[in-house]
Amino acid sequence: IWELKKDVYVVELDWYPDAPGEMVVLTCDTPEEDGITWTLDQSSEVLGSGKTLTIQVKEFGDAGQYTCHKGGEVLSHSLLLLHKKEDGIWSTDILKDQKEPKNKTFLRCEAKNYSGRFTCWWLTTISTDLTFSVKSSRGSSDPQGVTCGAATLSAERVRGDNKEYEYSVECQEDSACPAAEESLPIEVMVDAVHKLKYENYTSSFFIRDIIKPDPPKNLQLKPLKNSRQVEVSWEYPDTWSTPHSYFSLTFCVQVQGKSKREKKDRVFTDKTSATVICRKNASISVRAQDRYYSSSWSEWASVPCS
């Protein structure tokens, strides 16, 4: 058993049929010695008396809010949550496996630049009675500070018969050095509670590996005289790190016909313009990627050829 926060405790249980459970001793936080009784949740049934209460925690029915009273007055309370371990593996029932970039990916994180600011998100099909608390650091043995805000419900989607809820959190490295080579990874830890079930999820990454630039901005077409060719121009996204001479992007320019089956013409360039043939009913799209490190491409910025 360990303390998650003041008055909230996590009981770690091996979860299998007829498991013996864990013996837990609760102590009433009071100088009083006698006349103390214990109850669980909203029940008025007295579970025991005295300054301590010993319980055998085997299942969710044994978890909950234990309260000690004297003469109708609440003295203190302890919330017991359960963390299940099945076949040596901690349960992951609360969050959904996003399966990208690999199986057992529960937390996904992205950064728009090298400023030390990043966003993580996760999915669940559980609609309410949820608690999320997020902590982060760079490195784990001698951790350097990363400040995370509160998680927020960022999207709701219908997936077949189920509703899926996306939660996200923004974090900022306290003393980020955008130009420095990273040697220690960022660690993100999410404590998740659903009703009386506790789970924790972690992700470890370098900022350079989760970089995904915003799409190029101000995408414009300029027809070239007496030609089917156009000059496409764009700018670095506002959110990208500066100076651009150091934090450079490379670009992919794509001409795509109306039909997805039509052949796509693609040009790669380090410049912020390119000359392409604009076919009727086609569209031109441009995306960006860090020039010197193969992290994710941005989403496409698009304009119609006409």
Epitope: T131, F132, A151
Partner: nanobody, 119 residues
Amino acid sequence: EVQLVESGGGLVQSGDPLRLSCAASGPTYTMAWFRQAPGEEREFVAVISGGSTNYADSVKGRFTVSADNAKNTMYLQMNSLKPEDTAVYYCAGAGFYTTGTYYSLYDYWGQGTQVTVSS
């Protein structure tokens, strides 16, 4: 430490509405209402956290929780009040996301405001 102050309690007739307010001394991401009737355990009423809400079954459809983040204030609009809603109503707060119903999850507490519903 964030301070919470409840207001708006009072004596009303069965079926009447009442609006409670909870003012926080600083930004509080999650704010909740609990209530405690004489001789009863403190029970969850409603919570609002980053726009998400959760209600106790006993108040669903009658009570509405809302927040004005600019004023660091939460409200509980109580309609169709019943004698069994009589209790001291407490405001609770937390600095993280929760729609949980257990009061140990919450970090800060107000002193409470009395709501009495007469039949």
